[in-house]
Amino acid sequence: EPPTACREKQYLINSQCCSLCQPGQKLVSDCTEFTETECLPCGESEFLDTWNRETHCHQHKYCDPNLGLRVQQKGTSETDTICTCEEGWHCTSEACESCVLHRSCSPGFGVKQIATGVSDTICEPCPVGFFSNVSSAFEKCHPWTSCETKDLVVQQAGTNKTDVVCGPQDRLR
């Protein structure tokens, strides 16, 4: 009686179980009662990453330099090419199909996490006691100057965008 289900790494065709092609190979012809499945390796810029019965391999992804993409990891017959973005740019999605500029953190915000090829700058508001007076993609919030440690007093309070201004203590005569 013909099978209704096949083992792992097999497929059902013409009422019989044939072996799937291994990753990196495509199907040329199904097995028969007398012959094994015939598979062929994928070409130079092609891949298949699963056990399969595909008659065509997939083309490796093209990392288009006009979009700011470059190859992070070259594809093989079993894996696709992985793209990343040029320095100063990061991917807009996990698939990394285009790139955008790294964001700078505005005054009043500091860098929590520096951008990479796959993630943007993460900014955080400067908490009380800290400030940032520049727009930057790498500067963290700086602590306010401690006037006391310099034997000075606060003449002007600090904000999230400005440091405190220290001045001399009033001398009692």
Partner: antibody, heavy 115, light 112 residues
Framework: EVQLVESGGGLIQPGGSLRLSCAVS????????VSWVRQAPGKGLEWVGI???????AYASWVKGRFTISRDNSKNTLYLQMNSLRAEDTAVYYC?????????WGQGTLVTVSS | DIVMTQSPSTLSASVGDRVTITCQAS??????LSWYQQKPGKAPKLLIY???DLASGVPSRFSGSGSGTEFTLTISSLQPDDFATYYC??????????????FGGGTKVEIK
């Protein structure tokens, strides 16, 4: 056909403002980054600034807030707003597509700043 | 800001000559260097990107080399269509959210 076409140049007095346009066809501004590059008469090329596919911008250090790049995705057009123009801003202004290099250029539009 | 020093500023050559133009960056730019050809009244045309990659449709007599701060554009056998001005262009990201695209001063290749 993939192309960029600049317009909006002309004669303007010092201190005046001008908005240049760059109409793109054959590709989308929501996919590609585009820069403005200028060239003074008989001189070399000078980068002005860039707008990325998400609308983020960066400028040359000399711009100092005088110029602003923006875009209208529905019209597939980008703009260069130029304020407080000076004689030294006289140049052909090109828009050019690319991230670290410029693979596609428009024909340019001439801006003359003179009284 | 990054400064690109291109030399020579003018070069006299004949058809069939091997021509070399150099570009020096004021600081390391890895391989972020491209070369353009410009003819009078026309927009620049990309020849080479990433220091040595030939742009689409550009004849193989053009080649680029170098990395870091020293770069070279070579035309192996100068053709009548190659008499033009050539520019190098660097891309540099400072890491501080500052982007710089700097062009060399240009090299005019004229008929000897």
């Amino acid at each position: 056909e993939v192309q960029l076409v600049e317009s909006g140049g002309g004669l303007i007095q010092p201190g005046g403002s001008l908005r240049l346009s760059c109409a793109v066809s054959g590709f989308s501004l929501s996919t590609y980054a585009v820069s403005w590059v200028r060239q003074a008469p008989g001189k070399g090329l000078e980068w002005v600034g860039i707008i990325d596919s998400g609308g983020g911008t960066a400028y040359a250090s000399w711009v100092k807030g005088r110029f602003t790049i923006s875009r209208d995705n529905s019209k597939n057009t980008l703009y260069l707003q130029m304020n407080s123009l000076r004689a030294e801003d006289t140049a052909v202004y090109y828009c050019a597509r690319g991230v670290t290099f410029f693979g596609l250029w428009g024909q340019g539009t001439l801006v003359t700043v003179s009284s | 800001d990054i400064v690109m020093t291109q030399s020579p500023s003018t070069l006299s050559a004949s058809v069939g000559d091997r021509v070399t133009i150099t570009c020096q960056a004021s600081q390391s730019i890895s391989n972020y260097l491209s070369w353009y050809q410009q003819k009078p009244g026309k927009a620049p045309k990309l020849l080479i990107y990433r220091a040595s990659d030939l742009a689409s449709g550009v004849p193989s007599r053009f080649s680029g080399s170098g990395s870091g701060t020293e770069f070279t554009l070579t035309i192996s056998s100068l053709q009548p269509d190659d008499f033009a001005t050539y520019y190098c262009q660097a891309y540099y990201y400072s890491g501080g959210g500052s982007y710089d695209y700097a062009f060399g001063g240009g090299t005019k290749v004229e008929i000897k």
